[in-house]
Interface confidence: low
């Protein structure tokens, strides 16, 4: 009976010892898993930070690039606007100048039939000088303007003067 | 002696059982720690993805905005370039027109001293008509141009013709 009891107790001890060793192993596995998981978490955090930093840098680069391109375009636009203003002023001055010349030419052509400075009339008959008769005035006007036509093929804006 | 052995064995069993229960608790703690760590890792991943997506969206929005602003600037620049081209052509045409008028005016003034169309000379003496003498030509020229001066205060570009 005593031996039986001893055997039974020894079996209990062996069983509990086995459980003990199983638990020891399981505990170790769980601890290793925990450590691996924590390392993986740290790795994920690190990688995420790296990706975010890269994204941020790429975005900043794109933004910077866009800003520079915008600055170039803005400069080009402003220079063109300035140049256009100058050209507008130049065209305006040319139009005024043209109006003056047109008016002067008109005055000159009309003056053919009535010279501005009359010559004193002599008392008696004199030899006949070269004279201008009104009938030939239109012909004269046409010939002057014809002689000034630009070469064919160059379009000329109609005079605004 | 048997009782002593039994007592010793029982103490062993209790000790191992205590160890067992300790190990059980430690294993459970490690497993819970592992689960918590894995959940924390997933949370970190999810949050990182969210931040990345947000960064990406914000970057896309900025890029889109910059693209639109660039498109506006490019359009403005191109329109100004087009307008400038037109103004350059207009100024060129005005310059040509002015050159033509200047030449015509010169021809007209010169013609004062030598009419283009000669009038047949009569055989005998006739009453003296209005004549043009070369002496008065310069005075005539001066008066035409003076009469065409623009009002004060309007700047006029020097003629390029």
């Amino acid at each position: 009976k005593v031996e039986e009891l001893a055997r039974s107790l020894r079996m209990d001890i062996e069983r509990v010892a086995r459980e003990n060793s199983d638990l020891q192993r399981q505990k170790l596995e769980a601890q290793q898993g925990l450590q691996a998981s924590q390392e993986a978490k740290q790795k994920v955090e690190k990688e995420a930070q790296a990706r975010e930093a890269k994204l941020q840098a790429e975005c900043s680069r794109q933004t910077q690039l866009a800003l520079e391109e915008k600055a170039v375009l803005r400069k080009e636009r402003d220079n063109l606007a300035k140049e256009l203003e100058e050209k507008k002023r130049e065209a305006e001055q040319l139009r005024m100048e043209l109006a003056i010349r047109n008016s002067a030419l008109d005055t000159c052509i009309k003056a053919k039939s009535q010279p501005i400075i009359p010559v004193p009339r002599p008392m008696g008959p004199v030899p006949n000088p070269q004279t201008i008769d009104p009938a030939s005035l239109e012909e004269f006007k046409r010939k002057i303007l014809e002689s000034q036509r630009p070469p064919a093929g160059i379009p000329v804006a109609p005079s605004s003067g | 002696k048997v009782e002593e052995l039994a007592r010793s064995l029982r103490m062993d069993i209790e000790r191992v059982a205590r160890e067992n229960s300790d190990l059980q608790r430690q294993k459970l703690e490690a497993q819970q720690g592992l689960q918590a760590s894995q959940e924390a890792k997933q949370k970190v991943e999810k949050e990182a993805q969210a931040r990345e997506a947000k960064l990406q969206a914000e970057c896309s929005r900025q890029t889109q905005l910059a693209l639109e602003e660039k498109a506006v600037l490019r359009k403005e620049r191109d329109n100004l370039a087009k307008e400038l081209e037109e103004k350059k052509r207009e100024a060129e045409q005005l310059r040509m027109e002015l050159a033509i008028r200047n030449s015509a005016l010169d021809t007209c003034i010169k013609a004062k001293s030598q009419p283009i169309i000669p009038v047949p000379r009569p055989m005998g003496p006739v009453p003296n008509p209005q004549t043009i003498d070369p002496a008065s030509l310069e005075e005539f020229k001066r008066k035409i141009l003076e009469s065409q001066r623009p009002p004060a205060g309007i700047p006029v570009a020097p003629s390029s013709g």
């Epitope: - | 969210a50 947000k54 969206a57 929005r61 890029t63 889109q64 693209l67």
Partner: antibody, heavy 113, light 112 residues
Framework: EVQLQQSGAEFVRSGASVKLSCTAS????????IHWVKQRPEQGLEWIGW????????EYAPKFQGKATMTADTSSNTAYLQFSSLTSEDTAVYYC??????WGQGTTLTVSS | DVVMTQTPLTLSVTIGQPASISCKSS???????????LNWLLQRPGQSPKRLIY???KLDSGVPDRFTGSGSGTDFTLKISRVEAEDLGVYYC?????????FGGGTKLEIK
């Protein structure tokens, strides 16, 4: 689990104002853009705009500029959509959603004259 | 605004048969970051919309792989390889590339 819980149905008179709410659970609204969408009876969907609760950045569709006001309270994890001078045209179901794709169940707004 | 045109307006399909919905945009939806922000949604009767697909072809989690999205630029398609009873409802495409974001008019899928 990610959820967007919207406030209950509203019945209001023409000319009045109303404020709809959208409370998030399972995520932090400051980490995402929150969008609002309008759906009129038997009609399609119209995007109202988005808000970034983290910094208050807002983008409205031109049609809703001046009509709708989006706000957010990060402490209660809630986004809001407010309307003023309501008309019958504003009668619709309003949905909130976050950029990852989940939609709220919608709030029915009825404006009576 | 970018106009999203969906065809057909209504689609009557027998269970087990395939279905296809087209969505065309008035401007290219390719964003400067190289991504195309085109989503597909399904609104089942009496429910709020649910996103099925984002970035043209990426399936949302929990969406069966009988759904596929394709296309680029201005032309996009949603295909269902074998229609099931739970697929009935209104399908919408919507773009998130250009402000303001816009939706298609919807395609109603009916079961024959």
């Amino acid at each position: 689990e990610v959820q967007l819980q919207q406030s209950g149905a509203e019945f209001v008179r023409s000319g009045a104002s109303v404020k709809l709410s959208c409370t998030a659970s399972g995520f932090n609204i400051k980490d995402y853009y929150i969008h609002w969408v309008k759906q009129r009876p038997e009609q399609g969907l119209e995007w109202i705009g988005w808000i970034d609760p983290e910094n208050g950045d807002i983008e409205y569709a031109p049609k809703f500029q001046g009509k709708a006001t989006m706000t957010a309270d990060t402490s209660s994890n809630t986004a809001y959509l407010q309307f003023s001078s309501l008309t019958s045209e504003d009668t619709a179901v309003y949905y909130c959603l976050y950029q990852e794709g989940s939609w709220g169940q919608g709030t029915t707004l009825t404006v009576s004259s | 605004d970018v106009v999203m045109t969906q065809t057909p307006l209504t689609l009557s399909v027998t269970i087990g048969q395939p279905a296809s919905i087209s969505c065309k945009s008035s401007q290219s939806l390719l964003n400067s970051d190289g991504k195309t922000y085109l989503n597909w949604l399904l609104q089942r009767p009496g429910q709020s919309p649910k996103r099925l697909i984002y970035l043209v072809s990426k399936l949302d989690s929990g969406v069966p792989d009988r759904f596929t999205g394709s296309g680029s630029g201005t032309d996009f398609t949603l295909k269902i390889s074998r229609v099931e009873a739970e697929d009935l409802g209104v399908y919408y495409c919507w773009q998130g590339t250009h402000f303001p974001f816009t939706f298609g008019g919807g395609t109603k899928l009916e079961i024959k």
